[in-house]
């Protein structure tokens, strides 16, 4: 009886694992083995596929074959007993194009209200992704074990910290990798769960802001308690993206070590041009807080994010404020080619009660003012990218008197 060729051959490639699966054509014939050959592009001869010769099952692994993953190859299979079937040719394919990204390795560390996630590729020193290792980004799904309500977080790197969690609570998550340059989305990791710790006695510092004054950076933050000391650390933002980096080398800022106030001032030349991450930690001598949320700090934006310049047109019950580009020395306007949002603070000259308006537009109406009353206005600009969190210093306050009643037109 003639042996039939095997059919329905599937090639599964995950990272550097090459797996072949196929269907027997004739289940009734026993003791059949299967063998594969492969052929590289531009070659006439077929070569025996090592790892896939005389296979008794319907699956084989040819991961040991050192292929150029960007080069097209062709496979063929036949069944063998006393005689052999005809060859069945599999559609040619390029390993890299066919490959899927395997599940990443995930390691979790718990804080009281945060989880640190360390992610690394599932296959170390992968041949498949050798040229793309630095391009991996990850996404994750996280949920409270008790509720199951999922939150997705996209576009993270090999170390990510999730904040604003609840103490003593179990969270579960799974992570998958992506190579956006090749339109590849990977397979999710197994689910990992971890319980956040008991709430720390000292909370981390909050609301970190950087501004420029003269030739210095001024770093400010908020803190709940008095009589504390603080330290500030920085990290090159790009180091976070590096998958080979297991130790993030946060560095100290000399003028921000053991400061007793909720701000520190240091020379601009401490940082070269670039994007940095900053974090602050509090200590009372016995206990130490966890680190604050990290803020992104771009020296280019920070240096040139100047306070806005504005004109006020006074009416009886409102101000019309027209915001213009800030002026640099020499009175020439600064071109700021990134979107800004404006924070306008105003108050009655005789009172300390401030009111705030946030606007994207450069013409703003301040409503509900009293006639013939002096109001003061100051403004500052913020970048609209939440992560960059850049703010200019406030402009000098400008005070104007509203017009008498019935001049609102």
């Amino acid at each position: 009886k003639n042996l039939k060729s095997p059919q329905k051959v599937e090639v599964d490639i995950i990272d550097d694992n090459f797996i072949l699966r196929w269907n027997r054509s004739d289940e009734s014939v026993g003791n059949v083995t299967f063998s594969f050959d492969y052929q590289k592009t531009g070659m006439d001869n077929w070569i025996k596929l090592s790892g896939c010769q005389n296979i008794t099952s319907t699956k084989c692994n040819f991961s040991s074959l050192k292929l150029n993953v960007y080069e097209e190859i062709k496979l063929r299979i036949r069944a063998e007993k006393e005689n052999t079937s005809s060859w069945y040719e599999v559609d040619s394919f390029t390993p890299f194009r066919k490959a899927q990204i395997g599940p990443p390795e995930v390691h979790l560390e718990a804080e009281d209200k945060a989880i640190v996630i360390h992610i690394s590729p599932g296959t170390k020193d992968s041949v498949m992704w050798a040229l793309d290792g630095l391009s991996f980004t990850y996404s994750l799904v996280i949920w409270k074990n008790s509720s199951g309500v999922e939150e997705r977080i996209e576009n993270i790197y090999s170390r990510h910290k999730i904040y604003k969690l609840s103490p003593e609570t179990t969270y579960c998550l799974k992570v998958k990798a992506a190579l956006l340059t090749s339109w590849k989305i990977g397979v999710y990791s197994p689910v990992h769960c971890i319980k956040t710790t008991v709430e720390n006695e000292l909370p981390p510092p909050e609301n970190i802001e950087v501004s420029v004054q003269n030739q210095n950076y001024v770093l400010k933050w908020d803190y709940t308690y008095a009589n504390m000391t603080f330290q500030v650390q920085w990290l090159h933002a790009f180091l976070k993206r590096n998958p080979g980096n297991h130790l993030y080398k946060w560095k100290q800022i000399p003028d921000c070590e053991n400061v007793k106030t909720t701000q520190c001032v240091f020379p601009q030349n401490v940082f070269q041009k670039g994007i940095y991450l900053l974090r602050v930690q509090a200590s009372d001598g016995n206990n130490t807080s966890f680190w604050s949320e990290e803020i992104k700090f771009d020296t280019e934006i920070q240096a040139f994010l100047l306070p806005p310049v504005f004109n006020i047109r006074s009416l009886s019950d409102s101000f019309h404020i027209y915001i213009g580009a800030p002026k640099q020395s020499g009175n020439t306007p600064v071109i700021q080619d990134y979107p800004l949002i404006y924070e306008i603070i105003f108050w009655e000259n005789t009172s300390n009660a401030e009111r705030k308006i946030i606007e994207k537009k450069t013409d703003v109406t301040v409503p509900n003012l009293k006639p013939l009353t002096v109001y003061c206005v100051k403004a500052r600009a913020h970048t609209m990218d939440e992560k960059l969190n850049k703010s200019s210093v406030f402009s000098d306050a400008v005070c104007e008197k509203t017009k008498p009643g019935n001049t609102s037109k």
């Epitope: 080979g244 980096n245 560095k251 070269q272």
Partner: antibody
């Protein structure tokens, strides 16, 4: 003035374990990364691995399977162990401190010559 | 691991010469690069950190520049005590050193 003082066995037989210690005198231990570097005779510098004061480590992938670096914060000491040595491990071994303010190894130990011979 | 390739491997120069040594990284390392000087039988000495910052106590004739993959160490006017071997080193992930550049008297 911070000083790093190194010591350990200088003569080893193949397959033995190299063991070196580096003590930090006159300066703070925490907040720094501590590296071990070696230099075979007449050759360049090769980084072995590093550790921070909390014990987190990072190793040269080519040596990772044989290297253990540890810290004893109570003594301000860093230790290096390299198992299954061969003649290729013959070198001057240095410990060095990475600045806590910038990326550079700013303080070095005096170096320990280790020879592996049968 | 990131490879650092220094060029030249050795060079001869005279006192007073301006000398430039280059260091090329196999992938971008931003500015996390340092330069060291080592004299025979001595420990390496840090000259430049963060690619272009001069270490305290190092003469100003030494300077560093570059970012990304290409870096240079320049000695503006060679002094007799500058004849030594120079190494670059990156801190991007696993630390690696360049193979060294031997600077000898012409």
């Amino acid at each position: 003035q911070v000083q790093l003082q190194q010591w350990g066995a200088g003569l080893l037989k193949p397959s033995e374990t190299l063991s070196l210690t580096c003590a930090v005198y006159g300066g703070s231990f925490s907040g720094y990364f501590w590296s071990w570097i070696r230099q075979p005779p007449g050759k360049g510098l090769e980084w072995i691995g590093e550790i921070d004061h909390s014990g987190k480590t990072n190793y040269n992938p080519s040596l990772k399977s044989r290297v253990t670096i540890s810290v004893d914060t109570s003594k301000n000491q860093v230790s290096l162990k390299l198992s299954s040595v061969t003649a290729a491990d013959t070198a001057v071994y240095y410990c060095a401190r990475e600045s806590k303010y910038y990326f550079g190894l700013d303080v070095w130990g005096q170096g320990t010559t280790v020879t592996v011979t049968s | 691991a990131i490879q650092l390739t220094q060029s030249p491997s050795s060079l001869s120069a005279s006192v007073g010469d301006r000398v430039t040594i280059t260091c090329r990284a196999s992938q971008g390392i931003y500015s996390v690069l340092a330069w060291y000087q080592q004299k025979p039988g001595k420990t390496p000495k840090l000259l430049i950190y963060d690619a272009s910052r001069l270490e305290s106590g190092v003469p100003s004739r030494f300077s560093g520049s570059g970012s990304g993959t290409d870096f240079t160490l320049t000695i503006s006017s060679l002094q007799p005590e500058d004849f030594a071997t120079y190494y670059c080193q990156q801190f991007n992930s696993y630390i690696t050193f360049g193979q060294g550049t031997r600077l000898e008297i012409k």
